[in-house]
Structures are given as C-alpha cells and as structure tokens.
C-alpha cells in the first residue's frame, strides 16, 4: 500500500466448495496483511441462464488489478467464472456485472445473514 | 526467514510405508495450510493434498486417498505425510508447500525435498 | 478434474529473446492460477500469482497475463538463469493441478 505498516481488512466470506476444502461455508474473513502489501476483497460467480451460483468470496492477495476500487465490478464479457475484487471493509458485498464492450448492468445484492468470522 | 526443511531421503521395498516431515520456521505455524507435491524423475509436479495445521483437517487427491496420511505436530512445526503400500512408481521427490493465507492461495513457500526410492 | 495444457512443451532460445509460454484450463479458472520456475535438482519457486500479480522479488521481465482459461507468461528479455522448466498451476478447485511443463533450453 505505501503506506509502510501492515494493511488489515475485513471481507465478506463465501466458499461454495468448503466441505471439500475443508473451510468455513460463509462468515467475514479479516484480512492482515505484510508490510507494504495490499489486501483486496472479491466475489466469484456463475451466471447461469440469469440463476447467480456464489463461487467463493473472501480477501485476496495484493493484485494491482484491484487497486482504488471502491466497488466490486466484473467487467468479462461472458466469462464461466465472473470475479471483480475491490478495496474497502466488505465491498464484496456486493457485485456487480458491467461488460467494458457496454449492456446492461447487473447488480446482485445478498440477502440478510447474520455472517459469523472466521478464525 | 520463512522456511520449510525436510527430512533425508529414503530408499524403501514395495509394500512398505514412508514417512517424510516438513519443519517450518519463522512464521505462524496454524495460519498456514500445507500442501504436498510430488515429482516422479524426469516427470512434471502433481499436487497430492493438504493439510490445515490449525484444527488438523485434510483432503488428499482422488489418486492417493487411502494411502495418504498427513498429519502435523503444532508443538514442533511439523507436518508429515505417510504413503503406505509403496510400488516402484512412487519413487519420487516430495516438497512440503506452504500456502498463502488468502485467495488465490499460491504455494509460496517450498522445502528442499525428500527423495523417496522405491526398490526390490 | 481440471487439466492444465501448457505449450510448447520445450522452448530453445537465446539471451535476450522474448520467451512465450500459454496456459489453457479445461474449464474456467477466472484468475487462480500461479507460475512457478524451477531449476534442475531445486524446488519450484513462486513467480506470479492470480495469473497476472509479480510475487516479491521476482524479477519484473516475468509478466503474466489471462483470464478464464486461457494464460500466458511471457519473459520479455530472457536472462541466462532463466533457463529452467516452467508450470502453471490452478487453485481454483480440488484436486489442485499442474500443466505439464515447459522447458526453456539455450539455443
């Protein structure tokens, strides 16, 4: 970040595969980070035929693709995985799809949790 | 530094069982899962499993599930990973990998090595 | 499972060329996937992850580039210790997979 001290964030968390994986299902995730590292949060998802599936959520690793994003926009035009990343304490909330060869845009909002966090 | 040693290397008899350790060093040893890849000579690298220091937990590869057994020792920052019913094809190189504590998880720690042979 | 195509499966080339080396997932993988170099005898080090970010202290001739399924690593000005066999690597789901390898070789 520049900022020289250790970057901490917190992200919402998602893992759709998390029996397999052996994680936690959903809940926030804090995010520490090392010295002058960025930490991001992210979203993934299908989309199909207009039925979202959540793929996973959570912190991501300092990524320049990320930077000064201050919400978590998709912008692949058809993509099997659609990912956006932002920076902020839970901006993958939510997510959005808004193609860079234009159409419509596409925001998914995600309903009430109580969400706990994780260790 | 962050670092990942491993034991030497072994010369083992079809049927039998091999156990390699992996110590890490200067890092939290329960923030980081550890992973075990293996590289058979001559031959590309394949991802074998994990393990979360943490709470224990694994899952290993469709391939070696049954013969596999990772386990890990937070009191000494040791993982291990057991490969029982040993045949010639699992002579190899194992690495112990660490894991980025967050997505996309990139294995960005790797021990030296335990060459494992296995032969009649 | 996911399979990982890495071509061309070896590279010669020449100190100072630009080197190409792709990448395509059987599905797609967004942006989990990683680079790793390795040198005869030694370990696979960590070059880029989440397909295009530099990992520390990685020499910034290394790029990465791609989404979904199809990647590339490019070397834009190849040194002579970067002769060495190169692999991709997606994490986007278990069981983790490797693409073949590609060695870059001197010319």
């Known amino acids: 970040s520049g900022r020289g001290e250790a970057e901490t964030r917190e992200c919402i968390y998602y893992n759709a595969n998390w029996e397999l994986e052996r994680t936690n299902q959903s809940g926030l995730e804090r995010c520490e980070g090392e010295q002058d590292k960025r930490l991001h949060c992210y979203a993934s998802w299908r989309n199909s035929s207009g039925t979202i599936e959540l793929v996973k959520k959570g912190c991501w690793l300092d990524d320049f693709n990320c930077y000064d994003r201050q919400e978590c926009v998709a912008t692949e035009e058809n993509p099997q995985v659609y990912f956006c990343c932002c920076e902020g304490n839970f901006c993958n909330e939510r997510f959005t799809h808004l193609p860079e060869a234009g159409g419509p845009e596409v925001t998914y909002e995600p309903p009430p949790t109580a969400p706990t966090l994780l260790t | 530094q962050v670092q990942l040693v491993q034991s030497g290397a072994e010369v083992k008899k079809p049927g039998a069982s091999v156990k390699v350790s992996c110590k890490a060093s200067?890092?939290?040893?329960?923030?980081?899962?550890m992973h075990w890849v293996r590289q058979a000579p001559g031959q590309g690298l394949e991802w074998m499993g994990f393990?979360?220091?943490?709470?224990?937990?694994?899952g290993y590869a469709q391939k070696f599930q049954g013969r596999v057994t990772m386990t890990r020792d937070t009191s000494t920052s040791t993982v291990y990973m057991e490969l029982s019913s040993l045949r010639s094809e699992d002579t190899a190189v194992y690495y112990c990998?660490?894991?980025?504590?967050?997505?996309?998880?990139?294995?960005?720690?790797w021990g030296q090595g335990t060459t494992v042979t296995v032969s009649s | 499972d996911i399979q990982m195509t890495q071509s061309p499966s070896s590279v010669s080339a020449s100190v100072g060329d630009r080197v190409t080396i792709t990448c395509r997932a059987s599905?797609?993988?967004?942006?989990?996937l990683a680079w790793y170099q390795q040198k005869p005898g030694k370990a696979p080090k960590l070059l880029i992850y989440?397909?295009?970010s530099l990992q520390s202290g990685v020499p910034s001739r290394f790029s990465g580039s791609g989404s979904g399924t199809d990647f590339t690593l490019t070397i834009s000005s190849l040194q002579p210790e970067d002769f060495a066999t190169y692999y991709c690597q997606q994490a986007f789901s278990h069981p983790w997979t490797f693409g073949g390898g590609t060695k870059v070789e001197i010319k």
């Open positions: 990998a660490r894991v980025s504590r967050y997505a996309p998880e990139p294995m960005d720690v």
């Open positions: 989440a397909a295009s």
């Open positions: 599905q797609g993988i967004s942006r989990w």
């Open positions: 200067g890092y939290t040893f329960t923030s980081y899962r």
């Open positions: 393990i979360v220091p943490s709470g224990g937990s694994t």
